[in-house]
Amino acid sequence: PEPPTACREKQYLINSQCCSLCQPGQKLVSDCTEFTETECLPCGESEFLDTWNRETHCHQHKYCDPNLGLRVQQKGTSETDTICTCEEGWHCTSEACESCVLHRSCSPGFGVKQIATGVSDTICEPCPVGFFSNVSSAFEKCHPWTSCETKDLVVQQAGTNKTDVVCGPQDRLRA
């Protein structure tokens, strides 16, 4: 019979022969032959392989280094890598999450549009007319100006994007 030029899924071509790939969590020890099956070996502790493969070495689990602000989000298995995330108040600097930086705070005049997560930074937005923020914060949204009318008061000092309005009593001298 003609030697194959392509193999089925979960197989690979070697020496004109289709051999079974090793399943996730195992690595290749020796290719199959005409008389023997592919020989695979389980990954050891702290190692993994996450695909059907013909790798001769398992990969080492990622270490979530606390010195870089990292912590374990999900422990690795023989078939999955460890997933790192950042400590409270920090977020990853990249998709691979190899280190963390402190969440950005929104300056006065800006409010938090989206609170930061372990993988994304704070998103700030300028406070629109009618709203203000007088603090630098990673959590505070823009607050609406106080409504003087609902308190039977009048505006004594206009609000800005950084300050609330100042309310005062009605001018009783008016007829």
């Epitope: 070996l41 990954c43 502790e45 398992c58 080492q60 270490y63 374990v72 422990k75």
Partner: antibody, heavy 118, light 106 residues
Framework: EVQLVQSGAEVKKPGATVKISCKVS????????IHWVQQAPGKGLEWMGR????????KYDPKFQGRVTMTADTSTDTAYMELSSLRSEDTAVYYC???????????WGQGTTVTVSS | QIVLTQSPTIMSASPGEKVIITCSAT?????ILWFQQKPGTSPKLWIY???NLASGVPARFSGSGSGASYSLTISRMEAEDAATYYC?????????FGGGTKLEIK
């Protein structure tokens, strides 16, 4: 800084039970396996077993199976190893240690000496 | 269970001499760890994943091997290398250690 601090030396009578603690700092105990290793005087290292503190899953060497119990308290980041029905040959130093790749140091405790004597 | 046999059990080497310690398993394992222990102290991780040096280990040390045959090599022996070295496999339960190799300085 990662540290594993073990409880102090113990002297026990044959048939008694000893419980050794291993307090970790510098990492979350539930994130990595804790292994326990025995070393009798003048002898080599013997792996006793390991615990996954996250779910309490344990694996023991058959040599110690039935006499050893490994537990962990994630609220205090402390692992425990209890050895029962002690005999003179259990006189040894007992070590706790982490998964090898923790900071590529594979940290070890300072060891706890257990003496079994009548 | 996997039995690890270290060879030699005891040896002495002169400063500057090349040292090779072997660790042979009764069947294939994924990797070997090597630990160094000096009297009265806890063991220290020395080589992980067969060939990676642990933090702080001098570059004169190296590890190699695959399957059932592994080795630790010191390119040039130094006095501070005198210690007992243990190999360990963490592929199959129960995890096992080799019997140790005591390395002395001549």
């Amino acid at each position: 800084e990662v540290q594993l601090v073990q409880s102090g030396a113990e002297v026990k009578k044959p048939g008694a039970t000893v419980k050794i603690s291993c307090k970790v700092s510098g990492f979350n105990i539930k994130d990595y396996y804790i292994h326990w290793v025995q070393q009798a005087p003048g002898k080599g290292l013997e792996w006793m077993g390991r615990i996954d503190p996250e779910d309490g899953d344990t694996k023991y060497d058959p040599k110690f199976q039935g006499r050893v119990t490994m537990t962990a308290d994630t609220s205090t980041d402390t692992a425990y190893m209890e050895l029962s029905s002690l005999r003179s040959e259990d006189t040894a130093v007992y070590y706790c240690t982490t998964s090898y790749y923790v900071g590529t140091y594979g940290y070890w405790g300072q060891g706890t000496t257990v003496t079994v004597s009548s | 269970q996997i039995v690890l046999t270290q060879s030699p059990t005891i040896m002495s080497a002169s400063p500057g001499e090349k040292v090779i310690i072997t660790c042979s398993a009764t069947s294939s394992v994924s990797y070997i760890l090597w630990f160094q222990q000096k009297p009265g102290t806890s063991p220290k991780l020395w080589i992980y994943s067969t060939s990676n040096l642990a933090s702080g280990v001098p570059a004169r040390f190296s590890g190699s091997g695959s399957g059932a045959s592994y080795s630790l090599t010191i390119s040039r022996m130094e006095a501070e290398d005198a210690a007992t070295y243990y190999c360990q496999q963490r592929t199959f339960y129960p995890y096992t250690f080799g019997g140790g190799t005591k390395l002395e300085i001549k």
